[in-house]
């Protein structure tokens, strides 16, 4: 906290400019008018104030706006945004995408901070849903943003926003998140033809049910092994050898390298060895010939 002292003669700031970097903290406190600072916030970003000097400028704004800053000031905070706490940000009402972009730009190239997370949360809640423009903006700055949301939060993403999602945006999503996103993607891309549809839906297939995988196997999609390995195990298990062969096309040979990993390992255990042998890949671990396979889950459902 800077002590209240009178501004030395001739040092009263008439505008926010570079000369202020030579002011000591107490001089900034005494000589810079908070209202002037608020109206000329856009200049602060170009001035190499120290971290400590920015503390003083923040303090002045806090005194001027104890209930939270107006958006006209927020949009021009620049590096002063780095001084804000999540508690400060919760007082804001940010409605403009331009304001959001301006503040995300300040943190560009750095990990998502608690301040940024709070800002995004406030913005999205204010909008009521994660619309396409917002999602476009957020994933441009933070490719992993979507995967940081809970399944509940993802449920507010309208299918139209899915067009903004790039494959890398889903890299860190877990199956629960893909379970929510996949149906939205299926809806969003439903009017595309086979090959184009597959290109778009591919990244979301970690949430696809068995029946959709069966349908894809009839479309000569040639799914790569990386995509196959991300499929839900419970969705892969019911697929026949013939269906997997059709699904993977020329990539089926890759199964051998993955035979010890899920979901391939579990799928092999469910297939007849005879059927696996038809692939000519030397896959081992299938059900020996002459054995009867009982589906216990079906039996439990009936009893």
């Amino acid at each position: 906290e800077v002590e209240k002292t009178a501004c030395p003669s001739g040092k009263k700031a008439r505008e926010i400019d570079e000369s202020l970097i030579f002011y000591k903290k107490w001089e900034l406190e005494a000589c810079v008018d908070a209202a002037l600072l608020a109206t000329q916030m856009d200049r602060v970003n170009a001035i190499p104030f120290t971290y400590e000097q920015l503390d003083v400028l923040k303090h002045k704004l806090d005194e001027l706006y104890p209930q939270g800053y107006p958006e006209s000031v927020i949009q021009h905070l620049g590096y002063l945004f780095l001084k804000m706490s999540p508690e400060d940000i919760r007082k804001w009402n940010v409605t403009s995408l331009e304001t959001l972009k301006a503040l995300l730009e300040v943190n560009k190239g750095h990990e998502m901070s608690p301040q940024v997370a709070t800002l995004i949360d406030r913005f999205v809640k204010g909008r009521g849903q994660l619309d396409k423009d917002t999602l476009d903006t957020l994933t441009a700055f933070y490719p992993g943003y979507l995967c940081s949301l809970s399944p509940e939060e993802l449920s507010s993403v309208p299918p139209s926003s899915i067009w903004a999602v790039r494959p890398q945006d889903l890299d860190t999503c877990d199956p629960r998140q893909l379970d929510v996103l996949y149906p939205k993607a299926r809806l969003a891309f439903q009017n595309m033809n086979g090959s184009e549809y597959f290109v778009k839906i591919q990244s979301f297939l970690g949430g696809a049910p068995t029946e959709d995988l069966k349908a894809l196997s009839q479309q000569n999609v040639s799914m790569d092994l990386a995509t196959f390995m991300k499929l839900r195990t419970d969705a892969v298990l019911p697929l026949t050898v013939a269906e997997v062969q059709k699904l993977l096309g020329p990539h089926v040979e890759g199964l051998k390298a993955e035979e010890r990993h899920r979901p391939v390992r579990d799928w092999i255990l469910r297939q007849r060895q005879d059927d696996l042998d038809t692939l000519g890949l030397g896959l081992q671990g299938g059900i020996p010939n002459g054995y009867l396979v009982l589906d216990l889950s079906m039996q439990e459902a009936l009893s």
């Epitope: 570079e18 970003n45 170009a46 001035i47 190499p48 104030f49 120290t50 971290y51 920015l54 590096y79 002063l80 780095l82």
Partner: nanobody, 117 residues
Amino acid sequence: QVQPVESGGGLVQPGGSLRLSCVVSGSDFTEDAMAWYRQASGKERESVAFVSKDGKRILYLDSVRGRFTISRDIYKKTVYLQMDNLKPEDTGVYYCNSAPGAARNVWGQGTQVTVSS
């Protein structure tokens, strides 16, 4: 944020000269105004010289004006501080930084300047 690397400090007698250099690699050097700062033992860090991103606007702390000269070479991504007629009160660790670096509190090691007879 890439840390600046300062050099050129040393022990010099009053009235002597030093030329400090600061290399800022890895950042978009031409995008930012730069400043030299100094911190004397137990004191607040203070700005001593400023140069705008185009090099046209140059400002100095009152106590160094006429003795210090700041300049920048955009091709070498280097900022210089020529210090002449040095005084004992110029003693301290000298740092350079840009607005993003200073705001994030990311500093180099600095270079020690000692003015003493």
